[in-house]
């Protein structure tokens, strides 16, 4: 059988071949498509219902006025000479339609490094066949399951038209020290060969490279936390990161009620104020960072002040 | 939503001519098929024209074949049946309904007009 | 021309009762059948579409079925507003062919 491609929604015409170019005309068509469920048997006498889908011209051709997904399928004529000479064509018709440019949709404008992120949703409305959805990254095609590159793809038929919605959702780990500002686009490749891919235009988002957290300090005046009664400690909490954090305090586990502030001072220090002292410290673009914990403890005179906490009480303390 | 309105229906003398028409609404409609049925008192249905899209190609069984004649306006949205030598047996309901081929068959109708051909 | 040949002419139903129509084409007409319903009146509403495709907005009570050239309309449960006239029509040729009509009346 000849293959044949035809565009949706174009006529498009088969030639019967060794049939007369005039009638009388002794050629039959017979049709096996998704229109019907075996063979469908056309005659140039015939002229009905199948008119709209198919139809035989005077010349023995077959006209399909426009071209729809149930067209697939294959086609033969047989025609008869004026000599008696049978003569057959058959065809195997298959049709597509491309679709409109594909575009990407809720794409980031940032990415984090190190830290896998949703670079945006490629759409393509429209095709036939599906067709496939693929992503570039400077140019050069990015696989899925790859260097952290995931891709959530999801494909829609349209109930009525029978037309496919491609959608290509890309997820990305960018490098530590990699490009600042990587070009994503993503292409429409077509189902039917011959026919070249449909690019979106591209996306550059910024790569922002989060600054490695260094440990929050936590110094305790005097050391070892260990205090006569009455007298004062000072815990201060310490962080290298820039801009300055908001320090919280927490005794025992549970947030101090105190105002932000680097500084702890816990003054006239009786038995209440016993406990497992930690800083907390809230940076704007990570999440909260605790520091070690240490234990203030009261000596009684003659002892030795121990380096490890005992449970304390809920006395508040004072901020620098 | 879809609506086809029938006039011109009336009272007509054996070898008299009426003209009917249709009006279409609530969709494109050029691009269906059109068809007429037509009913006589108290019997069935029976299929009386259809029409392509374009107008291009009209059909009819035989029984109103060189009397009857079916056409369009895409423009105007119409939908027209010419009916000429009337005969008693031509006295109905006359249906506009779209569609008529194998894509889309009569999904839709008006609601009718009487024809009576009598002397 | 194609014939199509429906039965029964008419039948009597109580509500509540599964009523079953037949149409047989009298050469093969693939699935292009449809079934419609009309009351006195009024104009036909088409019910099914190729042979077993339920149209917009009819009750899935109804139900159409086809073997080769016989073609079936089933209704589940008969409710008091499907007291009506059914007909089938083939339009795989011309001249589109209605059937007879049943006629469904209440017992």
């Known amino acids: 059988a000849q293959n044949i491609t035809a565009r949706i929604g174009e006529p498009l015409v088969l030639k019967c071949k060794g049939a007369p170019k005039k009638p009388p005309q002794r050629l039959e068509w017979k049709l096996n498509t998704g229109r019907t469920e075996a063979w469908k048997v056309l005659s140039p006498q015939g002229g009905g219902p199948w008119d709209s889908v198919a139809r035989v011209l005077p010349n023995g051709s077959l006209f399909l006025p426009a071209v729809g997904i149930q067209d697939e399928g294959i086609f033969r004529c047989q025609a008869m000479n004026r000599n008696g000479k049978e003569t057959k064509s058959n065809y195997r018709v298959r049709v597509y339609q491309i679709p409109g440019k594909p575009e990407i949709v809720d794409s980031a404008s940032e990415l984090t490094a190190g830290v896998p992120n949703k670079v945006g949703t490629c759409v393509s409305e429209g095709s036939y066949p599906a067709g496939t959805l693929s992503w570039h990254l400077d140019g050069k095609p990015l696989v899925p399951n790859e260097k952290g590159v995931s891709v959530k793809e999801q494909t829609r038929r349209h109930p009525e038209t029978g037309l496919f919605t491609l959608q290509s959702e890309l997820m990305v780990t960018p490098a530590r020290g990699g490009d600042p500002r990587p070009t994503f686009s993503c292409s429409f490749s077509p189902g039917l060969p011959r026919h070249r891919a449909l690019r979106t235009a591209p996306i550059q988002p910024r790569v922002w490279e989060p600054v490695p957290l260094e440990e929050v300090q936590l110094v305790v005046e005097p050391e070892g936390g260990a205090v006569a009664p009455g007298g004062t400690v000072t815990l201060t909490c310490e962080v290298p990161a820039q801009p300055s954090p908001q320090i919280h305090w927490m005794k025992d586990g549970v947030p101090l009620p105190l105002p932000p502030s680097p500084v702890l001072i816990l003054p006239e220090i009786g038995p209440q104020d016993q406990g497992t002292y930690s800083c907390v410290a809230t940076h704007s673009s990570h999440g909260p960072q605790e520091s070690r914990a240490v234990s203030i403890s009261i000596i009684e005179p003659g002892e030795e002040g121990p380096t490890a906490g005992s449970v304390g009480g809920s006395g508040l303390g004072t901020l620098a | 939503e879809v609506q086809l309105v029938e006039s011109g229906g009336g009272l007509v003398q054996p070898g008299g001519s009426l003209r009917l028409s249709c009006a279409a609404s609530?969709?494109?409609?050029?691009?269906?098929?059109m068809t007429w049925v037509r009913q006589a008192p108290g019997k069935g249905l029976e299929w009386v024209a259809s029409?392509?899209?374009?107008?291009?190609?009209?059909y009819y069984p035989d029984s109103v074949k060189d009397r009857f004649t079916i056409s369009r306006d895409n423009a105007k949205n119409s939908l027209y049946l010419q009916m000429n030598s009337l005969r008693a047996e031509d006295t109905a309901v006359y249906y506009c309904?779209?569609?008529?081929?194998?894509?889309?068959?009569?999904?839709?109708w008006g609601q009718g007009t009487l024809v009576t051909v009598s002397s | 021309d194609i014939q199509m040949t429906q039965s029964p002419s008419s039948l009597s139903a109580s509500v509540g009762d599964r009523v079953t129509i037949t149409c047989r084409a009298s050469?093969?007409?693939?699935?292009?059948v449809n079934w419609f319903q009309q009351k006195p009146g009024k104009a036909p509403r088409r019910l099914i579409y190729?042979?077993?495709n339920l149209a917009d907005g009819v009750p899935s009570r109804f139900s159409g079925s086809r073997s080769g050239t016989d073609f079936t309309l089933t209704i589940s449960s008969l409710q008091p507003e499907d007291f009506a006239t059914y007909y089938c029509l083939e339009f795989d040729e011309h001249p589109l062919t209605f059937g007879g009509g049943t006629k469904v009346e209440i017992k």
């Open positions: 190729r042979a077993t």
């Open positions: 050469q093969d007409v693939g699935i292009y």
């Open positions: 029409i392509d899209n374009s107008g291009d190609n009209t």
């Open positions: 609530g969709f494109t409609f050029n691009n269906y098929w």
């Open positions: 309904a779209r569609g008529g081929d194998i894509k889309v068959s009569l999904d839709h």
